[in-house]
């Protein structure tokens, strides 16, 4: 049973509005119809789940309403966007992909994308 390869960019810089996007691509060993994608964050010797979505191939990813993640899928690629990021959210964001159905179950975990978030400088008060 070969480990499923998951590829993601090494580094991404969040926008000044605190939005970061990256592609998570997986090499599917079979014809999966149900896929689960989870974004993990590793920082300060702790791993936490940022968001997760299960989708049927060909359909949109559906994250929970209060999720900071959105995404779209195209074949074996998932385009992930994380919003509301601040400097304290800088860390390694890891893409975990599970092929849920049909059996057999496959799991792949990427090497992670280091997302750097820089809080914007507050605008100086203007006299005008």
């Amino acid at each position: 049973c070969k480990a499923m390869h998951v590829a993601q960019p090494a580094v991404v810089l969040a926008s000044s509005r605190g939005i970061a996007s990256f592609v998570c691509e997986y090499a599917s060993p079979g014809k999966a119809t149900e896929v689960r994608v989870t974004v993990l964050r590793q920082a300060d010797s702790q791993v936490t789940e940022v968001c997760a979505a299960t989708y049927m191939m060909g359909n949109e990813l559906t994250f929970l309403d209060d999720s900071i993640c959105t995404g779209t899928s195209s074949g074996n690629q998932v385009n992930l966007t994380i919003q509301g990021l601040r400097a304290m959210d800088t860390g390694l964001y890891i893409c975990k992909v599970e092929l849920m159905y049909p059996p057999p179950y496959y799991l792949g975990i990427g090497n992670g994308t280091q997302i750097y978030v820089i809080d914007p400088e507050p605008c100086p008060d203007s006299d005008f």
Epitope: A3, V47, T48, E49, L107, I109, G110
Partner: nanobody, 129 residues
Framework: QVQLVESGGGSVQAGGSLRLSCAAS???????LGWFRQTPGKEREAVAT???????SYADSVKGRFTISFDNAKNTLYLQMNSLKPEDTAMYYC????????????????????????WAQGTQVTVSS
């Protein structure tokens, strides 16, 4: 499909020894293998891991007392536990993760179970004083 089946465990007096075994099938040699433990109301913690090149890592709480090893011929993972203490009492789980990159750091990382998607059924270890 990776499958893990544990054996071993049981009850022992403090200072005693136990060996846990975990037979792995469908296992691919780029996996990270490890042992976790969990007590009621607490999260699973990584006790020991072994990488594809045979390099091992241990949680500080078991260093010098526990030894993880993998027998390639038998496709079996072992955890030799010596000088057991009452605080080692827990449910022990054998696990496999698909990315060795996270192997060595797992023992010092909270939430490291996220990296290990394949789990055995668990075996109880009870150490009495």
């Amino acid at each position: 499909q990776v499958q893990l089946v544990e054996s071993g465990g049981g009850s022992v007096q403090a200072g005693g020894s136990l060996r846990l075994s975990c037979a792995a099938s469908g296992y691919y040699n780029r996996y990270c293998l490890g042992w976790f433990r969990q007590t009621p109301g607490k999260e699973r913690e990584a006790v020991a891991t072994i990488d594809t090149d045979g390099s091992t890592s241990y949680a500080d709480s078991v260093k010098g007392r526990f030894t993880i090893s993998f027998d390639n011929a038998k496709n079996t993972l072992y955890l030799q536990m010596n000088s057991l203490k009452p605080e080692d009492t827990a449910m022990y789980y054998c696990a496999a993760g698909p990315n060795p990159r996270y192997c060595s750091g797992a023992v010092n990382t909270r939430g490291a179970e996220h990296y290990f998607g394949y789990w055995a059924q668990g075996t109880q270890v009870t150490v009495s004083s």
